[in-house]
């Protein structure tokens, strides 16, 4: 297993609709054709795999398990979007990248993106 650098933004604020997007960029030492991306959440004394996708370079990312994540890839960048977030989902979201094929296997883990989610205030009752 060889180490690889992964960069991601330090902080992202989710939209009022509970959507957060960030870019995960990895310094690929070679020409990987199969890449696996996993988003981990570290908070509340727990580590959770939020979503994971394996993709062939140039193809769309396919997430399993009715995923709340979507994403696209462009070169060594993965554009990740997490939706359906609520205030209690605030936490550190870490991007983990694995170059699966061809060998050698490379692993890179980012420092994490702190995603802040603020639940929208309910609309006040209208007099009209």
């Amino acid at each position: 297993c060889k180490a690889m650098h992964v960069a991601q933004p330090a902080v992202v604020l989710a939209s009022s609709r509970g959507i957060a997007s960030f870019v995960c960029e990895y310094a690929s030492p070679g020409k990987a054709t199969e890449v696996r991306v996993t988003v981990l959440r570290q908070a509340d004394s727990q580590v959770t795999e939020v979503c994971a996708a394996t993709y062939m370079m140039g193809n769309e990312l396919t997430f399993l398990d009715d995923s709340i994540c979507t994403g696209t890839s462009s070169g060594n960048q993965v554009n990740l979007t997490i939706q359906g977030l609520r205030a209690m989902d605030t936490g550190l979201y870490i991007c983990k990248v694995e170059l699966m094929y061809p060998p050698p296997y490379y692993l890179g883990i980012g420092n994490g993106t702190q995603i802040y989610v603020i639940d929208p205030e309910p609309c006040p009752d209208s007099d009209f």
């Epitope: 509340d44 979503c51 989902d89 936490g91």
Partner: nanobody, 125 residues
Framework: EVQLVESGGGLVQAGDSLTLSCAAS????????MGWFRQASGKEREFVAA????????SYADSVKGRFGISRDNAKKMVYLQVSSLKPEDTDVYYC??????????????????WGQGTQVTVSS
């Protein structure tokens, strides 16, 4: 309705390993998030680990990360908790639970609708 039955608990020495099993019947097993919780007498139930419906995603409490491993076999309707490097503080009743999902960034807070009767794990020093 889902019925859950745990097995595999017992008395072990500190540092030993153990595999807890949870057999499910009824319901569509492959659509449920499955979790393991533990509870010592007189204390609150504590989240240990959870696994997504297909088994591709997992979640662990920091206290067990790296020592415990959760897995599932949807064909056999089974969930497993491999526990290693056991410590006396791991002594608890371990419960298997099922939640309708879907998977979230905080599966410990899902509503677990179905629970097993628990299996006792006692770790002696």
């Amino acid at each position: 309705e889902v019925q859950l039955v745990e097995s595999g608990g017992g008395l072990v020495q500190a540092g030993d390993s153990l595999t807890l099993s949870c057999a499910a019947s009824g319901g569509t097993f492959s659509t449920y998030v499955m979790g393991w919780f533990r509870q010592a007498s007189g204390k609150e139930r504590e989240f240990v680990a959870a696994i997504s419906p297909s088994g591709t995603l997992t979640s662990y409490a920091d206290s067990v990360k790296g020592r415990f491993g959760i897995s599932r076999d949807n064909a056999k309707k089974m969930v497993y908790l491999q526990v290693s490097s056991l410590k006396p503080e791991d002594t608890d009743v371990y419960y298997c639970a099922a939640a309708r999902g879907p998977w979230t960034p905080r599966p410990s807070l899902l509503t677990y609708d179905y629970w097993g009767q628990g299996t006792q794990v006692t770790v002696s020093s």
